[in-house]
């Protein structure tokens, strides 16, 4: 496979990763697929420094990240361990709130207007952030 050594056009480089910030909203699953088609993933926040970087770029706008509990436990889309990793939830979140009247609870995490995290209904059309790591071998399958 090939290695990505610089960020694509319209992406922002930071700490050996590339980030793309959407200008409009999609449901979480569509945002997730969008990033995958870019050979990327929804942003995985692993440190307070990365949190501040993303927060600076998105501003006070609800924005999806690559964290969900649609299959039970909370999971990062790239396999980063949730339990031992960085977290920045709002107080009393996540709460899997059922009172929204949209059916089910809240299974997808997003940055809120102050940057802290909340769980919400995955169908809500929020902005999103894609991330891909530089120097990472691509997922290109071997030639047969």
């Amino acid at each position: 496979g090939s290695e990505r050594t610089c960020c694509p056009v319209n992406w922002v480089e930071h700490e050996r990763s590339c980030y793309w910030f959407s200008r409009s909203g999609k449901a979480w699953a569509d945002a997730d697929n969008y990033c995958r088609l870019e050979d990327a993933h929804l942003v995985v926040v692993t440190s307070w420094e990365e949190q501040k970087f993303v927060q600076h770029h998105i501003g006070p706008v609800n924005t999806w990240m690559g964290l969900h509990d649609q299959n039970g436990p909370w999971k990062w889309v790239d396999g980063t361990d949730y339990e031992t990793g960085f977290k920045n939830w709002r107080p009393e979140q996540p709460d899997d709130w059922y009172g929204h009247g949209l059916g089910g609870g809240e299974d997808c995490a997003h940055f809120t207007d102050d940057g802290r995290w909340n769980d919400d209904v995955c169908q809500r059309p929020y902005r999103w952030v894609c991330e891909t790591e530089l120097d990472k071998a691509s997922q290109e399958p071997p030639l047969l």
């Epitope: 569509d30 697929n33 088609l37 050979d39 290109e140 399958p141």
Partner: antibody, heavy 121, light 108 residues
């Protein structure tokens, strides 16, 4: 000039197989997701499949899932669609198209002229 | 899946006419709407992306508008080369993109 050229279409019996190819030129092929879209005679356009630039992510329309396989060879700037268990309703002109993203938000900005697939006994 | 409904399915017009084609989505798709032109035996052409942005190289007589569920493609002054079939496409659902059924623009 940016160009896509499909080939591999033809007449095939129901249950048969066919492999379509799409040769790309004049753009950095491996950077872009690529898609197949078809148009049955007298019908509208139907999205069939898409593959990411590296080939690591693939998606299919429900109508072809489990029967069609999209793949790419970035060293040859070529996109493929392996079609198995073909049915009469798969008869269509098959177009390959380049997905432009970023500010375009999932538009298909370059298309080939298409190749005709006819499934008939 | 999101359903896209175009109207009319066909129309007859003369060179110089103003032509309007509408597209309605079965749910709110914000501005995730593209327009394409198809001619027999030719490669389809992207005209408008994100509802109102004109694709590079496309004549300015083509314009798009709308957001949410209702969208419009307008040709301000129809030219001989504009007789074709036009399709809208939603790109809100990634990647299960769906198209309208098409609008054929014929010579009156």
């Amino acid at each position: 000039e940016v160009q896509l050229l499909e080939s591999g279409g033809g007449l095939v019996q129901p249950g048969g197989s066919l492999r379509l190819s799409c040769a790309a030129s004049e753009f950095t092929f491996s950077t872009y997701a690529m898609s197949w879209v078809r148009q049955a005679p007298g019908k509208g356009l139907e999205w069939v499949s898409v593959i990411s630039g590296s080939g690591g992510s693939t998606y299919y329309a429900d109508s072809v899932k489990g029967r069609f396989t999209i793949s790419r060879d970035n060293s040859k700037n070529t996109l493929y669609l392996q079609m198995n268990s073909l049915r009469a309703e798969d008869t269509a002109v098959y177009y390959c198209a380049k997905r432009s993203s970023g500010w375009y938000e999932d538009a298909l900005d370059i298309w080939g002229q298409g190749t005709m697939v006819t499934v008939s006994s | 899946d999101i359903q896209m409904t175009q109207s009319p399915s066909s129309l007859s017009a003369s060179v110089g006419d103003r032509v309007t084609i509408t597209c309605r989505a079965s749910q709110n798709i914000s501005s995730y709407l593209n327009w394409y032109q198809l001619k027999p035996g030719k490669a389809p052409k992207l005209l408008i992306y994100t509802a109102s942005s004109l694709q590079s190289g496309v004549p300015s007589r083509f314009s798009g508008s709308g957001s949410g569920t209702d969208f419009t493609l307008t040709i301000s002054s129809l030219q001989p080369e504009d007789f074709a079939t036009y399709y809208c496409q939603q790109s809100y659902n990634t990647p299960t993109w769906t198209f309208g059924q098409g609008t054929k623009v014929e010579i009156k």
